[in-house]
Amino acid sequence: SGVFQLQLQEFINERGVLASGRPCEPGCRTFFRVCLKHFQAVVSPGPCTFGTVSTPVLGTNSFAVRDDSSGGGRNPLQLPFNFTWPGTFSLIIEAWHAPGDDLRPEALPPDALISKIAIQGSLAVGQNWLLDEQTSTLTRLRYSYRVICSDNYYGDNCSRLCKKRNDHFGHYVCQPDGNLSCLPGWTGEYCQQPICLSGCHEQNGYCSKPAECLCRPGWQGRLCNECIPHNGCRHGTCSTPWQCTCDEGWGGLFCDQDLNYCTHHSPCKNGATCSNSGQRSYTCTCRPGYTGVDCELELSECDSNPCRNGGSCKDQEDGYHCLCPPGYYGLHCEHSTLSCADSPCFNGGSCRERNQGANYACECPPNFTGSNCEKKVDRCTSNPCANGGQCLNRGPSRMCRCRPGFTGTYCELHVSDCARNPCAHGGTCHDLENGLMCTCPAGFSGRRCEVRTSIDACASSPCFNRATCYTDLSTDTFVCNCPYGFVGSRCEFPVGLPPSFPW
């Protein structure tokens, strides 16, 4: 679609005569009829296939034609066409005399024609005017012409329709050749596709307008490159959505079971060594001079009664010191200067000489010990309490204070953790050395089978078009992560483009 424009510039009819040679009375009131048709080697009669236009009376005899003439006329004259410009044309311009105001052919005198010219030629679409002048015996016409495209039409033949737009169907302006030029932030054949925020993940992110980054289900972050872990995941991460890959030292479905109590809580005091021995279970190996479950109790070095033969112990900053009774010497008063003649055995102990009377040995009655039977027997020295139980002297007897989970005289019996039926929903309980373990029936999980889980919702492969399926354990549902070009809860719909321009 375009317009052939004809600019009439000057008409000369000095003698003021008609084509027949007869003069106009009082002068030739001149108007023009223009016929534009397809190229003909010889201009032929017949329809003006590209259009016709008439002017009002523009002047008398000889006159210059002003641009945008008054009196209802237009200069340049417009001959619109609604087809591909062929590049060639035939143009016929007639000058007529109108004695009155009625310019219809049938209202004119029989010989009202002043002059008629016809040209044929090639003409490319463009802004430049072609100037021409046609002379007959009595008249001269100077004019120029050009072909330009109508609004929204482009290209060498005005055949390319392009209407700038900024809506759902596209975001573009038109280049001189009619090709689309996308507005900033848009791309694609029809500039319908927004350019997402720079760095927005190709698969996991999308956008509905430029510089946006909206995340697909299971992804988060400014660029949608961070997966969302399973709902309730405590000490874990993910590499794909809804995962819960436990951090070191944590276990369980939600990574909330502490497998490294030593590191996370540092329960052992006074430089003791901590060993993990199961979930939330540990053992402290105390440094010398400390005792207790967490080695929190400072031992006096004299508590182990290191002084023999009735020597008395004195605590010192760097150890202890034995004060030996008469007749004894050595670090622990272990060397004797006595013999049986000195009656060295206390508490009714009987003395036996040895090495020809050079030294002796005491045989102690029950409940006494030591080289001179000077010590009451400490029933705790042999560490009779098992499983970390604490030994307590109680007069002539002793007793063990057991750690939780143990019982018996010497804490040798394991209390059954399963006795109180801790496993929910029909879970099977197993006693372990350091606690218990529940084996859960289908549909349940957790340390005590307390969490209801679904059978894997992705097992039935519900997602189409090679989409990735994720099971949302918290809702017993699945989520499909669509590949580019597909939408829908199961990625079942391809994203289509309009087949042609929708305007």
Epitope: L18, A19, G46, P47, T49, T52, D111, L113, K116, A118
Partner: antibody
Framework: QVQLVQSGAEVKKPGASVKISCKAS????????IHWVKQAPGQGLEWIGY????????NYNQKFKGRVTFTTDTSTSTAYMELRSLRSDDTAVYYC????????????WGQGTLVTVSS | DIVMTQSPDSLAVSLGERATISCRAS??????????MKWFQQKPGQPPKLLIY???NQGSGVPDRFSGSGSGTDFTLTISSLQAEDVAVYYC?????????FGGGTKVEIK
Amino acid sequence: QVQLVQSGAEVKKPGASVKISCKASGYSFTAYYIHWVKQAPGQGLEWIGYIAGYKDATNYNQKFKGRVTFTTDTSTSTAYMELRSLRSDDTAVYYCARDYDYDVGMDYWGQGTLVTVSS
Amino acid sequence: DIVMTQSPDSLAVSLGERATISCRASESVDNYGISFMKWFQQKPGQPPKLLIYAASNQGSGVPDRFSGSGSGTDFTLTISSLQAEDVAVYYCQQSKEVPWTFGGGTKVEIK
């Protein structure tokens, strides 16, 4: 009113020439075209060609080209057709008709001129 | 050359009845949305008279009972209610390409 008046009937020998006239009145002769059409006895219509009234622009049917010539005299608003090397099958009524650029077609016709070619 | 074929060759129709004449061109006579097709009426001893131009436009002074239709290669002239003065030979003619060509004619008579 528009009128096209043709010259009278002609009898010619084979090989001779004939020149038929068509005088126009009632309209601006130079604005229009003049067609020439042949109609043999009892036959249909056959287009010979045309001439533009405003300049020597002509178009001939190849079948007649070389034997036919169109001319005009704008001072008398008259068109002429000359047919040379006459043959017996040139015996026919020859019509002139006017035509225009704004497609009405051949809207006015002359009364026809009978040309008889006989030895 | 474009060949114009008319049918039928002759047609007898009762007064007041519809008469339909067809004309087929050997190739399209349309150009830039215009059909370069005309219909003429010729009565005995008279020159032809223009009835229809551009396939469907009535010539000056032509009665409304004459109408034309068609495009491309197939065209029709219809006389909606035949009158006695319509007895004549009717010709179709194309002016798209030189040489302009006429159909062979259809003779319309009263039945």
